[in-house]
């Protein structure tokens, strides 16, 4: 899974818009039942916040044991705490489940910092605020971990929603969503609306707060405004996409678009930040600094380490630029752009100064594993993971944080040539792509 600011904290050539509107959301035929419309029972089924992840309530075993599970589109294992741990309020007790089956196989998942290991098995799993189905799914029962669970995060496991190729110990371990689609009539699609608070939350507020929605098997039109724009999933492992152009306040970074996708670009709800390859990060920060040069901030702020505080309600959002990522469109030579505000990439942090302050961390950071469009990007948008049609859709989220002057945006189409050249082809080796 991705490293760096990872949750678990492991916090192109563009052109003028075309005159015509190309087909987008309107070309969808609702060929699967329940694919579109209202999913009232699933709305607001996520809690949490960008710094510690978004979780959904799930039940495991018979009788059902309720656990909060981190929603992670950057990994592919369903793994839950299965032994006492200082940071866990509860854990999966396999011995109490009459439907648990041991696979007699271990699994070990190391990160750059930290790791978890456990024992593989299967059991019956359901999502109370999800589709009304129960599936037998693979479960990694975590028996030992280091720097994986987060104190106070309120989740006890992780739901990896990516593809089998990156499952541990290998791609033969069927991920949860694959099992769900195979065993039920749930369409092969899910969508996420992550709602960043926009202001710090204390512990009691987090426990009581609404974090967003995971719509399993469909798209809920109440969760977004405007149109959905789709970008192809380049390869089914992570949710890999291709970025073709980057702009800061409308100014093109003017880099070879391959740099934006070196060595990949993924959409990952389990990462806090927008993470950018080293060269891209340096260029982006230089541009953001220039755009916000009326105020200077300490070097450590731009490294995502130091916090900057303003008197409550006086954060100068207007001095910080918007950031636009252009994504490959579904039509040849057509792209669209998603634009985020500083309200997304400055992450509110709690309990560090006085109540008279609003304090923030810079939530864009450097990556050695490619671009990671983490929670700070996703909090601006309703994101549709349309696995059936091998594409990811973006629309402006109905819950994104903005001000009276600017809003997040999804716009297009734009003419962009040679977009295929923006993808980076990772050299194939026998070694795991996960250990970087």
């Amino acid at each position: 899974t991705q490293h760096g600011i990872r949750l678990p904290l492991r916090s192109g050539l563009g052109g003028a818009p075309l005159g015509l509107r190309l087909p987008r959301e309107t070309d969808e035929e609702p060929e699967e039942p329940g694919r579109r419309g209202s999913f009232v029972e699933m709305v607001d089924n996520l809690r949490g916040k960008s710094g510690q992840g978004y979780y959904v309530e799930m039940t495991v075993g018979s009788p059902p044991q309720t656990l909060n599970i981190l929603v992670d589109t950057g990994s592919s294992n369903f793994a839950v705490g299965a032994a006492p741990h200082p940071f866990l309020h509860r854990y999966y007790q396999r011995q109490l489940s009459s439907t648990y089956r041991d696979l007699r196989k271990g699994v070990y998942v190391p990160y750059t910092q930290g790791k978890w290991e456990g024992e593989l098995g299967t059991d019956l799993v359901s999502i109370p605020h999800g589709p009304n189905v129960t599936v037998r799914a693979n479960i990694a029962a975590i028996t030992e971990s280091d720097k994986f669970f987060i104190n106070g995060s309120n989740w006890e496991g992780i739901l990896g929603l990516a593809y089998a190729e990156i499952a541990r110990p290998d791609d033969s371990l069927e991920p949860f969503f694959d099992s769900l689609v195979k065993q039920t009539h749930v369409p092969n699609l899910f969508s996420l609306q992550l709602c960043g608070a926009g202001f710090p939350l204390n512990q009691s507020e987090v426990l009581a707060s609404v974090g967003g929605s995971m719509i399993i098997g469909g798209i809920d039109h109440s969760l977004y405004t405007g149109s959905l724009w789709y970008t192809p999933i380049r390869r089914e492992w992570y949710y890999e996409v291709i970025i073709v152009r980057v702009e800061i306040n409308g100014q093109d970074l003017k880099m070879d678009c391959k740099e934006y996708n070196y060595d990949k670009s993924i959409v990952d709800s389990g990462t806090t930040n927008l993470r950018l390859p080293k060269k891209v990060f340096e260029a982006a920060v230089k541009s953001i600094k220039a755009a916000s040069s009326t105020e200077k901030f300490p070097d450590g702020f731009w490294l995502g380490e130091q916090l900057v505080c303003w008197q409550a309600g006086t954060t100068p959002w207007n001095i910080f630029p918007v950031i636009s990522l252009y994504l490959m469109g579904e039509v040849t030579n057509q792209s669209f752009r998603i634009t985020i505000l500083p309200q997304q990439y400055l992450r509110p942090v709690e309990d560090v100064a006085t109540s008279q302050d609003d304090c923030y961390k810079f939530a864009i950071s450097q990556s050695s594993t490619g671009t990671v469009m983490g929670a700070v990007i996703m909090e601006g948008f309703y994101v549709v993971f349309d696995r059936a049609r091998k594409r990811i859709g973006f629309a402006v989220s109905a819950c994104h944080v903005h001000d009276e002057f600017r809003t997040a945006a999804v716009e297009g189409p734009f003419v962009t040539l040679d977009m295929e050249d923006c993808g980076y082809n990772i050299p194939q080796t026998d070694e795991s792509t996960l250990m970087t």
Epitope: K296, Q306, V352
Partner: antibody, heavy 120, light 108 residues
Amino acid sequence: QLQLQESGPGLVKPSETLSLTCTVSGGSISSSSYYWGWIRQPPGKGLEWIGQIYYSGSTFYNPSLKSRVTISVDTSKNQFSLKLSSVTAADTAVYYCARLGHGYSYFDLWGRGTLVTVSS
Amino acid sequence: EIVLTQSPATLSLSPGERATLSCRASQSVSSYLAWFQQKPGQAPRLLIYDASNRATGIPARFSGSGSGTDFTLTISSLEPEDFAVYYCQQVYVWPPRTFGGGTKVEIK
């Protein structure tokens, strides 16, 4: 080398405005590498940050003093100033001006300080 | 609010002895911590920044260590001019407004 020197009245009456100026010599206040700040120290007590300014005029103030503090900069004179309104005896202190360097994070150079007494 | 607690309040030592001063933060400040020395009637002087880096012109007998919440300033062998008050300051939360209460190092 660069030096900082505070100047201003040593005695201010209660309810009046305390005004101090810090003159930067041996270097330019317009350097993009520094903020310029004010810190005070009541007699026999610890240090309290008042606020800071960048040569462009961008300011940050201590929330507990914000309603009474104004810090300004005059790049033509290579000076920055502090005004603290509605003073009381609790504002009696040695006032220091200082340079905030090392990535705008640390007070790496200080003036000698000037004692301001608030008394009628 | 991050509170810095310095201990001991007073340290009575003789020249040539080793001085160990502590600064504890109420929550993690990473390595964004400075140490200052202040002699009577003088302005504070920056000794250490980023928890362990000596400022320009500071003798090697001064060293800083620690990260997160616990920090130490060590003076390996006290010289007569080292008897003063020492302050820590965190700059993890910026602007850098929080100082510790100080430790006075006095001659025994």
